[in-house]
């Protein structure tokens, strides 16, 4: 089949990095600068992606593969192939329409990206709060109150954090 196809279509012999040039009797011409073809038999080369502004070049474009971008420090990639760069916030914050805002009481974000999430509700699992939550950290759930009955081994909770919070009950 391949042999038949190449007899019918001379372009199928053009390797990656070239294109089948109709203006030159369908001979294989190298991709022009700033373009590439990642597969053989192509009639055109694709324009290389340019990493501009907050996008920086992670991998240069070659005649056979597109450039790859990532984000400049202070930003992180979103979307397939890093199609967007989003500004980082601090831990304990989330990016809103009005910029980086502190997490509301009862929520936390332990990363520089993403949204603030509610503290774990320890009581739903029949447990008690061992360490209070903060804007940057979730609560730590400890043994259930029943497990801490007299005679049972108890856990001494550490000193409260600087910004103590309580798990929403």
């Amino acid at each position: 089949f391949e042999r038949t196809r190449s007899l019918q279509d001379p372009c199928s012999n053009c390797p990656a990095g070239t294109f089948c040039d109709n203006n030159r009797n369908q001979i294989c011409s190298p991709c022009p600068p700033n373009s590439f073809s990642s597969a053989g038999g192509q009639r055109t080369c694709d324009i290389c992606r340019q990493c501009k502004g907050v996008f920086r070049t992670r991998k240069e474009c070659s005649s056979t593969s597109n450039a790859e971008c990532d984000c400049t420090p202070g930003f992180h990639c979103l979307g397939a192939g890093c199609s967007m760069c989003e500004q980082d916030c601090k831990q304990g914050q989330e990016l809103t329409k009005k910029g980086c805002k502190d997490c509301c009481f009862g929520t936390f974000n332990d990363q520089k990206r993403g949204i603030c999430r509610p503290w774990t509700n320890c009581s739903l699992d029949g447990k008690s709060v061992l360490v209070n939550g903060t804007k940057e950290r979730d609560v730590v759930c400890g043994p259930s109150p029943a497990d801490l009955s007299p005679g049972a081994s108890s856990v001494t909770p550490p000193a409260p954090a600087r910004e103590p919070g309580h798990s929403p009950q």
Epitope: F55, C82, M84, E86, K97
Partner: nanobody, 122 residues
Framework: EVQLVESGGGLVQPGGSLRLSCAAS????????MSWARQTPGKGFEWVSG???????YYTESVKDRFTISRDNSKNTLYLQMNSLRPEDTAVYYC????????????????WGQGTQVTVSS
């Protein structure tokens, strides 16, 4: 071909003012959201301000009440009026299209100018 050309940068004393301009061509400016970013050697890139085609404006916290973004669709020009300038505002300022309409987010299809240097120093 899309072109964004910034101008108006320079050296200014703390407390002073500058007005940056960005002349746009090669696309329908009036229906495009636009933004300003800045880049400092120490802090890297920072999203500064954005304006929707309808005129709604957005600012990063550190420039609120000091900077004003505006646009003149008849002149295809974006502006950034910078008042009460501080040494920490020293940066290269870039004009960019803002297709995502999301604070602090640019997409690969957005276009960028070459930047204009703003230096705030006594």
């Amino acid at each position: 071909e899309v072109q964004l050309v910034e101008s108006g940068g320079g050296l200014v004393q703390p407390g002073g003012s500058l007005r940056l301009s960005c002349a746009a061509s090669g696309f329908t400016f009036s229906s495009s959201a636009m933004s300003w970013a800045r880049q400092t050697p120490g802090k890297g890139f920072e999203w500064v301000s954005g304006i929707y085609s309808g005129g709604s404006t957005y600012y990063t916290e550190s420039v609120k009440d000091r900077f004003t973004i505006s646009r003149d669709n008849s002149k295809n020009t974006l502006y950034l009026q910078m008042n009460s300038l501080r040494p920490e505002d020293t940066a290269v300022y870039y004009c960019a299209t803002w297709g995502t309409l999301r604070f602090g987010v640019w997409a690969e299809y957005d276009h960028w100018g070459q930047g204009t240097q703003v230096t705030v120093s006594s």
